[in-house]
């Protein structure tokens, strides 16, 4: 039926064959109902994207303990409610442990790899480079764009965006969210973070044509460059101190 | 005060065009979308169009599809509305409104209005 | 396409309570009030819940799961017009729409 597709989720099959005919979206590769009046959960969506494939400064350093997802794409295990399940393992059997937004945060190992718990991610620290413009954005005006971006295109609580950072050309996005303020039906930093990454990248998830458009007092913010830093409640386990470069 | 003045209404020949224009003023219209609306007489409201802050996207009803063009003057403050081969189900009063969420993954939606203009009224007929 | 589903029409006493349900959509409700045909609509709630500063505080509205529900706790002679819903088509294309309307008359 022509009328019953998901806005919120380009990555789902839907149909009417629901109680009473209602439009019912199911994300493709595992088959999990998915609420297409919000966001859908960044383990579901890369489970989808597989599935598809298949088919004096003001910036701010990343902490030691923050890391990079250099690993990039994998076919994730989700729960239920499509969280991140702590261990991961590829066809292999080489295994991980994940972060609530599944990034990796141990060395990999066998299957007797033991993850107790999905350690939360309660600070996502979000970097872009924007092309050169002729004036530099007044940072007053380009924090509250991309405020009510954040607001209005992911729902995300105002109070999870703590600050924007800049200095020409580096934007950093701080988003925080520890697991107790977190509500029941307020949007995850983790998917805020990747549906921004993959419009920012032209990728929308969102199934109409409407694209990201940010300006800032009307001139156009053209991103080149994103790399997203990810620090846990608890620090990753790596076997050596590092600080992964992506 | 928000104010949107619409005109460029009145009697128009079936397969003509017309263009009617939405003067805004007391906001910063380069930070809105903005809709076009429209009434049959004794009919109800219906979505014509819409266009973004940057003029970048538009998005039309099915009924004016290949037949409309939103364009905005950011500068002037204005909003156009072009409708070409007009027919008799094009009578109504257009009306010129604002949207309020401009970011909104369902920013097209007509829930989004926050502010209308008076309207200009549109009779199609030989 | 889709429609949005509202009441045709709803009556009240003045100081009751009247709810108005619109469903159908995705979230981003607005409500249109209508006081005569071909006259200017008034908004009197958008994006859900939102209310402009000039619209009474009498008027409310509340968002549950895919219905968008107008309140007017103590109605008023002066609220007797007709109600538009406005929303979010999915269908291809991703366009507003609106329902039909609601004509609310106060006894």
């Known amino acids: 039926q022509s009328n019953c597709t998901c806005p919120t989720n380009k990555m789902t099959v839907c149909d009417t064959n629901g109680p009473g005919g209602v439009c019912q979206c199911r994300a493709m590769g595992s088959q999990v109902l998915v609420d297409c009046s919000t966001l859908t959960s960044k383990c579901l969506l890369l489970k989808a994207r597989m599935s598809a494939r298949k088919s004096g400064r003001s910036l701010v350093m990343p902490s030691e303990h923050a890391i990079l997802d250099n690993d990039g794409l994998y076919d994730p295990e989700c729960d239920d409610k499509g969280r991140f399940k702590a261990r991961q393992c590829n066809q292999t059997s080489v295994c991980w442990c994940v972060n609530s937004v599944g990034v990796r945060r141990t060395d990999k190992g066998d299957q007797s790899l033991r993850c107790d718990e999905v350690v939360r991610t309660h600070h996502i620290l979000i970097e872009l480079r924007h092309r050169p413009t002729d004036r530099a954005f007044n940072h007053s005006d380009l924090d509250s764009e991309l405020r009510r971006l954040f607001q209005e295109r992911y729902k995300l609580h105002p109070s999870f965006l703590s600050a924007v950072h800049y200095e020409e050309p580096t934007i950093q996005i701080e988003l925080r969210q520890n697991a107790s303020q977190k509500g029941l039906r307020d949007v995850d930093i983790a998917d805020a973070a990747y549906y921004f990454e993959r419009d920012i990248k032209g990728e929308s998830l969102f199934m109409g044509r409407r694209g990201l458009d940010v300006q800032v007092r009307g001139e156009p913010l053209h991103v080149e460059r994103t790399l997203i830093y990810y620090l846990d409640e608890k620090p990753p386990q790596f076997s050596m101190k590092r600080l992964t470069a992506g | 005060a928000v104010t949107l003045d619409e005109s460029g209404g009145g009697l128009q020949t079936p397969g003509g065009g017309l263009s009617l224009v939405c003067k805004a003023s007391?906001?910063?219209?380069?930070?809105?979308?903005m809709f076009w609306v429209r009434q049959a007489p004794g009919k109800g409201l219906e979505w014509v169009g819409v266009?973004?802050?940057?003029?970048?996207?538009?998005n039309y009803a099915p009924a004016v599809k290949g037949r409309a063009t939103i364009s905005r003057d950011n500068g002037q403050s204005t909003l156009r509305l072009q409708l070409n081969n007009l027919r008799a189900e094009d009578t109504g009063t257009y009306y010129c409104?604002?949207?309020?969420?401009?970011?909104?993954?369902?920013?097209?939606?007509?829930?989004?209005?926050?502010?209308w203009g008076h309207g200009t009224e549109v009779i199609v007929s030989s | 396409a889709l429609a949005l589903t509202q009441p045709s029409s709803v009556s009240a006493n003045p100081g009751e309570t009247v709810k108005i349900t619109c469903s159908g959509g995705?979230?981003?409700y607005g409500w249109y009030q209508q006081k005569s045909p071909g006259s200017a609509p008034v908004t009197v709630i958008?994006?859900?819940?939102k209310r402009p500063s000039n619209i009474p505080s009498r008027f409310s509205g509340s968002l549950s799961g895919s219905t968008n529900t107008l309140i007017i706790t103590g109605v008023q002679a002066e609220d007797e017009a007709v109600y538009f819903c406005?929303?979010?088509?999915?269908?291809?294309?991703?366009?507003?729409?609106f329902g039909a309307g609601t004509t609310l008359t106060v006894l």
């Open positions: 406005g929303g979010y088509d999915s269908s291809p294309g991703y366009v507003g729409i």
């Open positions: 995705y979230s981003g």
């Open positions: 266009i973004n802050r940057s003029g970048s996207y538009t």
């Open positions: 007391g906001f910063d219209f380069i930070d809105y979308d």
């Open positions: 958008y994006w859900n819940d």
């Open positions: 409104a604002r949207g309020a969420c401009t970011h909104c993954w369902d920013a097209d939606s007509a829930g989004y209005i926050d502010a």
